[in-house]
Amino acid sequence: AVNGTSQFTCFYNSRANISCVWSQDGALQDTSCQVHAWPDRRRWNQTCELLPVSQASWACNLILGAPDSQKLTTVDIVTLRVLCREGVRWRVMAIQDFKPFENLRLMAPISLQVVHVETHRCNISWEISQASHYFERHLEFEARTLSPGHTWEEAPLLTLKQKQEWICLETLTPDTQYEFQVRVKPLQGEFTTWSPWSQPLAFRTKPAALGKDT
């Protein structure tokens, strides 16, 4: 038997993926465990094998279909179970009634690109990935810019309180290398959280023109 504190957390990406992490103090690393999804109003069940990500936590993705297919709605409830093999039997280690649109975490924004760069400003655009059409425009973004000599944690957060897939960064230093990241969050959902940060986009501001009056 496995004793200890257990935590089972899952998020829906709003389309066709439920990502789950199960943490269990004192669990055996080589035990075979599965997440089993049982929707209340769908004809499919889905499993994924939990793989170790640290000493006491495991993760897997329930892939429900093609990446952009809308597999669940706001009225769905999915019973999620962690089952681990004990000899010839499978034991339920954790269970939750999962409301997908109350537990959202979107994919990180993609396709970041510099639209226009000057000496002191830079216009950047991006796209959201695998986000449900149900949200319409009900999304918000956070962005951050990495300046030379600083860390990402020190970067101030810029908040965009609407579905705006671009930003104009101002008051930048000429001829300087920067990096930029953005993340997205739906307004819907009691336990909804921010997406992962996008891959960083590196850019350089233009040098100040020499010999010109300012």
């Epitope: 089993h36 499993t47 094998e49 793989l51 892939i63």
Partner: nanobody, 123 residues
């Protein structure tokens, strides 16, 4: 709709080897737990081996343990059955099966199936 196509069957002498392949199309391959079954003439379809979606865990019927190895290549949408030290009693049509639910795949009923590939082991 998911489609499965097996290949690699044939006639082999006892003690020989064969490698079966099953290519999956029509859906996201990594959704599926994959299994091999076999059906000898006049007998029911029998579970042989299963591999989880990640490929980390495999299970076998007792009669093939140590001789057969099931594996998958998620980049190639393919599951394999490497059969070594074949015996005449391994003669059967071998079927590839797919199910999104690991816990249902052995029950046969809700699986997607390939057309099968004949394996004949002569003594």
């Amino acid at each position: 709709e998911v489609q499965l196509v097996e290949s690699g069957g044939g006639l082999v002498q006892a003690g020989g080897s064969l490698r079966l392949s099953c290519v999956v199309s029509g859906d996201v391959f990594v959704r599926y737990t994959m299994a091999w079954f076999r059906q000898a003439p006049g007998k029911e379809r029998e579970f042989v081996a299963v591999v989880t979606d990640s490929g980390r865990t495999t299970e076998y019927v007792d009669s093939v343990k140590g001789r057969f190895t099931v594996s998958r290549d998620n980049a190639k949408n393919t599951v394999y059955l490497q059969m070594n030290n074949l015996k005449p009693e391994d003669t059967a049509v071998y079927y590839c099966a797919a199910n999104t639910d690991y816990f249902q795949i052995r029950s046969v009923d809700n699986n997607a199936w390939g057309q099968g590939t004949q394996v004949t082991v002569s003594s």
